[in-house]
Amino acid sequence: QEEDLPRPSISAEPGTVIPLGSHVTFVCRGPVGVQTFRLERDSRSTYNDTEDVSQASPSESEARFRIDSVREGNAGLYRCIYYKPPKWSEQSDYLELLVKESSGGPDSPDTEPGSSAGPTQRPSDNSHNEHAPASQGLKAEHLY
């Protein structure tokens, strides 16, 4: 009998409000035994896969997706899903990435990276838990 897979979690380092041109790393976490993590965008057809999975704790594994230089087009909602043979998990909640001007003008978000406000999480619509493809590697630039 197949086990019930826990939903993955998603977070961003150093935070969810990132200055233009700075780096951000999405961290996807799931149980041990994960073979593939996938990072998806909300309204875009692009996604990133990685099989570079590390053990974060005795009961948890993780994968990291890094964007070296954040652009305005990187702003938006992201979510994770993982494959633990023989099946895929449900998707995580969405995490919202905000990109602000480096100068920090009047329209900049109040929340700074790493601040206590924490990541914005939105429920993922798991009634349409689909989408598709895969590309290897840790870089997430093409999710733009």
């Epitope: 057809s45 692009t46 494959y83 689909e130 989408h131 493809p133 093409h142």
Partner: antibody, heavy 115, light 111 residues
Framework: AVKESGGRLVTPGTPLTLTCTAS????????IQWVRQAPGKGLEYIGA?????YTYYASWAKGRVTISRTSTTVDLKMTSPTTEDTATYFC?????????????WGPGTLVTVSS | ELVLTQTPASVSAAVGGTVTIKCQAS??????FAWYQQKPGQSPKLLIY???KLASGVPPRFKGSGSGTEFTLTISDLECADAATYYC?????????????FGGGTEVEIK
């Protein structure tokens, strides 16, 4: 590569299962769509099996076909074909990193429904 | 259900010329869009996806643009080998399922 099989001449109402076989890649990562083309006509979407195990159908295909997958194949079962289902049936796999484009297509398998 | 309206149904152009094909979606489909080329007796070939990315091996004479509901395929410096039927497709799987529809096709003749 992907390759369709199972196409043949059948009489109306005779169930028929077409199989899309994947080779050279891990099927679990990909969406597979089924598309058909009647002689001299355009491409018609039938449905898709997504990597996460969900299945979607064109509105006209609901109740007429069933799509299922194993670790290496995606099947299209035609429950009660009619003469209007005569066509070449294609399966296709989406491109790495983007769900929007299907870069890998099989050669197609011909289904003829005739009494 | 999503409808893709593709125009024109057919077009004729000279070698070295330019052809523009348009595809209009009845609902916004974001980047879930692609263009295909099909020649008689062959399987469709992916040209453009995402909806402006060039598929592997496709020459840059083929250009895709647009987003949301309006999409365009432009073929410049036409060659005899470009004679084919071109299809647009949405492959959207989203909060509202709009998925997998094809446009009606555009037959391109090279004079």
């Amino acid at each position: 590569a992907v390759k369709e099989s199972g196409g043949r001449l059948v009489t109306p109402g005779t169930p028929l299962t077409l199989t899309c076989t994947a080779s050279g890649f891990s099927l679990y990562k990909y969406n597979i769509q089924w598309v058909r083309q009647a002689p001299g006509k355009g491409l018609e979407y039938i449905g898709a099996s997504t990597y996460a195990g969900y299945t979607y159908y064109a509105s006209w295909a609901k109740g007429r076909v069933t799509i299922s997958r194993t670790s290496t194949t995606v099947d299209l079962k035609m429950t009660s074909p009619t003469t209007e289902d005569t066509a070449t049936y294609f399966c296709a796999r989406h491109i790495d990193g983007d769900y929007s484009g299907y870069a890998l297509w099989g050669p197609g398998t011909l289904v003829t429904v005739s009494s | 259900e999503l409808v893709l309206t593709q125009t024109p149904a057919s077009v004729s152009a000279a070698v070295g010329g330019t052809v523009t094909i348009k595809c209009q979606a009845s609902q916004s489909i974001g980047t879930w869009f692609a263009w295909y080329q099909q020649k008689p007796g062959q399987s469709p070939k992916l040209l453009i996806y995402g909806p402006s990315k060039l598929a592997s091996g496709v020459p840059p004479r083929f250009k895709g643009s647009g987003s949301g509901t309006e999409f365009t395929l432009t073929i410049s410096d036409l060659e005899c080998a470009d004679a084919a039927t071109y299809y647009c497709q949405s492959t959207y799987f989203g909060v509202d399922y709009l998925g997998g529809t094809f446009g009606g096709g555009t037959e391109v003749e090279i004079k």
